[in-house]
Amino acid sequence: MAVTACQGLGFVVSLIGIAGIIAATCMDQWSTQDLYNNPVTAVFNYQGLWRSCVRESSGFTECRGYFTLLGLPAMLQAVRALMIVGIVLGAIGLLVSIFALKCIRIGSMEDSAKANMTLTSGIMFIVSGLCAIAGVSVFANMLVTNFWMSTANMYTGMGGMVQTVQTRYTFGAALFVGWVAGGLTLIGGVMMCIACRGLAPEETNYKAVSYHASGHSVAYKPGGFKASTGFGSNTKNKKIYDGGARTEDEVQSYPSKHDYV
């Protein structure tokens, strides 16, 4: 019962998390104009992974897509890639976990197969969550770097009288959505992995018993061939799971002086 609850909860948490990752990826407010120097601006700028927008005080909003692919900063492309990989892995994980749910019966699927699928989906959720967290964190780091650079160059005097205020950008709502969603997906994945341990049946360790018949000296193990091959109708095999170690190449980023719009 506890295993079913853990698996179900893990699925629901991951589902919410992946929905959040998708929402964050689609949101336009990854970076928003910093209003510290001008809290009553009549023009408000914000940017997403796919387009940049300007909301006027009049209520008119205009968004322009980044129609170039090669002209965009590598870091932005990396963030896009991480978020898409996170969504794809999460979606596959959700699909696998639906069939792995203990409360859903599909044909004569054995518990061992369900356990295997639960672990697979759990690992996928963990990697998906990590991708989202990494993507959002890379973007946040990019913002912090650009923020302090533009702060240093904030006011450039023109003829000593005219001021040109450089627009600074700070964390947008999408970053927080992404961090929370990534965390939820990660937690959901861990819960699925925990549930998998409960789903995987314990193998009964039968001790080899020697029967001494008169005139014969034959020793055998109960179950015979069936027990060793696992082809018998009522046999259950113990699986050995290897999570594997994943290493990701580190991409060194050089702070860009300019925003990507």
Partner: antibody
Framework: EVQLVNSGGGLVKPGGSRKLSCAAS????????MHWVRQAPEKGLEWVAY????????YYADTMKGRFTISRDNAKNTLFLQMTSLRSEDTAMYYC???????????WGQGTSVTVSS | DIVMTQSPSSLTVTAGEKVTMSCKSS????????????LTWYQQKPGQPPKLLIY???TRESGVPDRFTGSGSGTDFTLTISSVQAEDLTVYYC?????????FGAGTKLELK
Amino acid sequence: EVQLVNSGGGLVKPGGSRKLSCAASGFTFSDYGMHWVRQAPEKGLEWVAYISSGSSTIYYADTMKGRFTISRDNAKNTLFLQMTSLRSEDTAMYYCARFVRGNSMDYWGQGTSVTVSS
Amino acid sequence: DIVMTQSPSSLTVTAGEKVTMSCKSSQSLLNSGNQKNYLTWYQQKPGQPPKLLIYWASTRESGVPDRFTGSGSGTDFTLTISSVQAEDLTVYYCQNAYSYPLTFGAGTKLELK
């Protein structure tokens, strides 16, 4: 046809109060931010206050802050400007205007004259 | 606050002449997000409310004759009337539409020579 009709002006004593109205018609009033702009006799235009479509954002000119209150009734398609502690320098023609793209004001009321004098 | 400075304060012209008036802002009105300049031009005839001519520094409002042209970027802006008509002889105001408080220039008055 878009129309903005100003009313409520008149002669007021210094320190007195007045409430100006702006009745809108010919457009969906609740979709637009609105402004009050004034013009002293033989002088230029001076922005007074702004209110967003849903009244969530309100801005005032520094000289009007604390004395003037902008409000709107979307059900009645009406914009208001409550003026208190009036001074002689508040004597002007008061216009309401509709706020549109480019943060520009495309339609203006005909104006209502407020004279502050003892 | 952004200070708007219009020059000249008055201009004497003849009908059919090309007229140029200037508007300078104390801060850049160029928005980096959409590369648009938030400057608006209005025309005001005596006894009438102002009329919108140009927004985003160069976008003509619908119904405005094409003899009116707005140009400029950052802090320096210009309103040009290619061939002045009798009905154009009035006052023109520029306005900062970038930051609150919204500020107007003192105006340029066109007068007949």
